[in-house]
Amino acid sequence: HTVELNDMFGQIQSPGYPDSYPSDSEVTWNITVPDGFRIKLYFMHFNLESSYLCEYDYVKVETEDQVLATFCGRETTDTEQTPGQEVVLSPGSFMSITFRSDFSNEERFTGFDAHYMAVDVDECKEREDEELSCDHYCHNYIGGYYCSCRFGYILHTDNRTCRVECSDNLFTQRTGVITSPDFPNPYPKSSECLYTIELEEGFMVNLQFEDIFDIEDHPEVPCPYDYIKIKVGPKVLGPFCGEKAPEPINTQSHSVLILFHSDNSGENRGWRLSYRAAGNECPELQPPVHGKIEPSQAKYSFKDQVLISCDTGYKVLKDNVEMDTFQIECLKDGTWSNKIPTCKIVDCRAPGELEHGLVTFSTRNNLTTYKSEIRYSCQEPYYKMLNNITGIYTCSAQGVWMNKVLGRSLPTCLPECGQPSRSLPSLVKRIIGGRNAEPGLFPWQALIVVEDTSRVPNDKWFGSGALLSESWILTAAHVLRSQRRDTTVIPVSKEHVTVYLGLHDVRDKSGAVNSSAARVVLHPDFNIQNYNHDIALVQLQEPVPLGPHVMPVCLPRLEPEGPSPHMLGLVAGWGISNPNVTVDEIISSGTRTLSDVLQYVKLPVVPHAECKTSYESRSGNYSVTENMFCAGYYEGGKDTCLGDSGGAFVILDDLSQRWVVQGLVSWGGPEECGSKQVYGVYTKVSNYVDWVWEQMGSPQGRAPGGTVS
């Protein structure tokens, strides 16, 4: 009879075991375990009748189609075999064990005690057959195995071979190299590769296979396994396989498809090809005069580009447009995209205008081309070049005028200060009684007219000031203070200020420069009670052009001592000699009490102590501070007066021979102007040099003569 066993392990014993088995007995045990397992059988006890070639009693172990072993007897002899310690392994998941005893037993035989168990098959080790083994990696587990692939590969649906995804390769460059995947290593199995070469219309693709060419083939049938096919439009070239590379292929097309197919077996190295685009040739090129063509080639074909550039100092000229380079291209019809341009010498064109300066050409015919030279100079004697640079500019290869120091920046012409076009005379009579100043003697002299139109009727007054630069006037703070205030200091509105420069005769303002104010800056500490810090600045709306009648005065060095006692200084003004005259009369110049023509006076600086004492002795609260100095004569007769306020008290600096503003007309005693022992009091400008520069927003060294050094 037959016993079916399906467990993963078990015990099989001869009938009647451990007693002797009966005669004429036959039992078959069929053991089945799951796929991926095999059966291991071994005997713990074995005692059967001996016979030649186990003819009588035996245990036979077999599979479906193969006897694995036949055992009998008690011990192994030449003609019979006992299992002993031997293990029987089934090749598969099935094992059949048959026990047979014949009709007679001379002795008593105890039979056998056998055990079986399912053992895992290591398919990864045992599968030698290429058709069954994993292509790349094999992973065993109890009862089975699975395959996986190297990076970049995909497991085929057969779960065994590794293919690549290579159906989306686009080549658009004019040259390139295409290979089978992993070349020169064996190409993957079960793959369908598609390579597209897609170039611009007008190119023709040439294919050239290289030496190594190894695609699985067949001796009789052409390329049944793996192959390359080349598709050009409707035409298909190939299939190609084997070890001999195809000859070079001129496709005559700009669009080519390369198909590569591999089946699930074989180990071949694959292939490599290079492709090159060919196109129509264009005519030979001649570089322009003073120019060159890059790259320089014997032949140029479709899509080749050349760059035309010019020698240093020349520019490419194309359709009247200047450029650094010009590119042309060989077209598919074999013509160039454009004509070769010309190279034109760089032209810096007319040099930029220099404010307060002029330009002269060093090169003949006023040439402005490459390497030409020009020279900038300032309008002397009114302006001087900053940093004393040469002013020579050369036309550079970039088409800009260049100076060794300043580069492409223009030089700066700064006003000269304290040098009137007309020398000041040494002997001067008093203002009162009248000494006319010749035009140009005091080119810094400014008439400041204030008309406060915010009041009805308008308030109107005037004072003097001194030009410090093209845009700034120095004056006394009290001139620019709103008049209808008792103790508070509020500047007048800039809209109410007009400044006249180059004015000689107030009856004739036509020759003067009049300017409105952009800013009015009073010293923040100006004190209306004692006129301490009586200094202010007016910034003009527009810079004024300098000339013989309009030139700045120099600022002094920063020195608290101020001008030395007994030094002589000059003050100019259109001051009033009759204190009862009204401002309307002054400004309209309708009365002779105002001096129509600018007057000036020469006054000595009074020792500080003497002046202080002279004012302290009077009734009234007069204070001569360290920010003031006095000038005038003990006996009187010469003085500044109303309307001269804010005017400059100038002293000639011995070292620089420039006129320096040491004082500003500030105040005087209660008596009439020019009275005995009534000295004029002046703001000591040297105490305010830093403040002035700070307001004007420029460092001391900026103006050549801005401050005497």
Epitope: S454, V456, P457, D459, R484, D486, T582, L642, S645
Partner: antibody
Framework: QVQLVQSGAEVKKPGASVKVSCKAS????????IEWVRQAPGQGLEWIGE????????DYNERFKDRATFTADTSTSTAYMELSSLRSEDTAVYYC??????WGQGTLVTVSS | DIVLTQSPDSLAVSLGERATINCKSS????????????LAWFQQKPGQSPKLLIY???TRESGVPDRFSGSGSGTDFTLTISSLQAEDVAVYYC????????FGGGTKVEIK
């Protein structure tokens, strides 16, 4: 013609605020000071302060500095005076004046509980 | 602040006669820079707004009859009506124009 037209009479309770307007016409409003002056019934004139509409600059009589506020709307050429924390002694006619020469018709402000 | 003291408080003058009003300042009103005395005179008729008569102490406003005149300098100022007319009945005020501006107490002019 050149004129200043003020807003109508107001009656206010003590502690409240009042805002009087003054519309200018016939001249450049931004360029001239507008003064505010008041006159209590049967009394003399008292200067409150002034504003320059173009710049917004103001000057106040110390007596009114904490309670009076001057503003100007240049788009409508109108000046305003607001007086806060009103008391009965603020009952007066309030005038706006173009820098002395031109006076508005006056606005009577009555403060009464 | 500058104080202006007007005198007399009231004045009764016959038609055609001269009327004189004084105004005294606690501070000098003459500005040496503009050469002006910042003092003005106003007329206020009953139920009306004040009207400018004189500015800068002596300059007559346009449209003001020439019987009105101003004089003085520094601290003492005078308004004169040379020949009083019926329409001149009013209260007259002086005003100084240094900030803060101040008014005199007023002088009432009536017909005798």
């Amino acid at each position: 013609q050149v004129q200043l037209v003020q807003s109508g009479a107001e009656v206010k309770k003590p502690g409240a605020s009042v805002k009087v307007s003054c519309k200018a016409s016939g001249y450049t409003f931004t360029g001239k000071w507008i003064e505010w002056v008041r006159q209590a019934p049967g009394q003399g004139l008292e200067w409150i302060g002034e504003i320059l509409p173009g710049s917004g600059s103001t000057d106040y009589n110390e007596r009114f500095k904490d309670r009076a506020t001057f503003t100007a709307d240049t788009s409508t050429s109108t000046a305003y005076m607001e007086l806060s924390s009103l008391r009965s002694e603020d009952t007066a006619v309030y005038y706006c004046v173009r820098s002395e020469d031109l006076w508005g018709q006056g606005t009577l402000v009555t403060v009464s509980s | 602040d500058i104080v202006l003291t007007q005198s007399p408080d009231s004045l009764a003058v016959s038609l055609g006669e001269r009327a004189t009003i004084n105004c005294k300042s606690s501070q000098n009103l003459f500005n040496s820079r503009t050469r002006k005395n910042y003092l003005a005179w106003f007329q206020q008729k009953p139920g009306q707004s004040p009207k400018l008569l004189i500015y800068w102490a002596s300059t007559r406003e346009s449209g003001v009859p020439d019987r009105f005149s101003g004089s003085g300098s520094g601290t003492d100022f005078t308004l004169t009506i040379s020949s009083l007319q019926a329409e001149d009945v009013a209260v007259y005020y002086c005003k100084q124009s240094y900030i803060p501006f101040t008014f005199g107490g007023g002088t009432k002019v009536e017909i005798k």
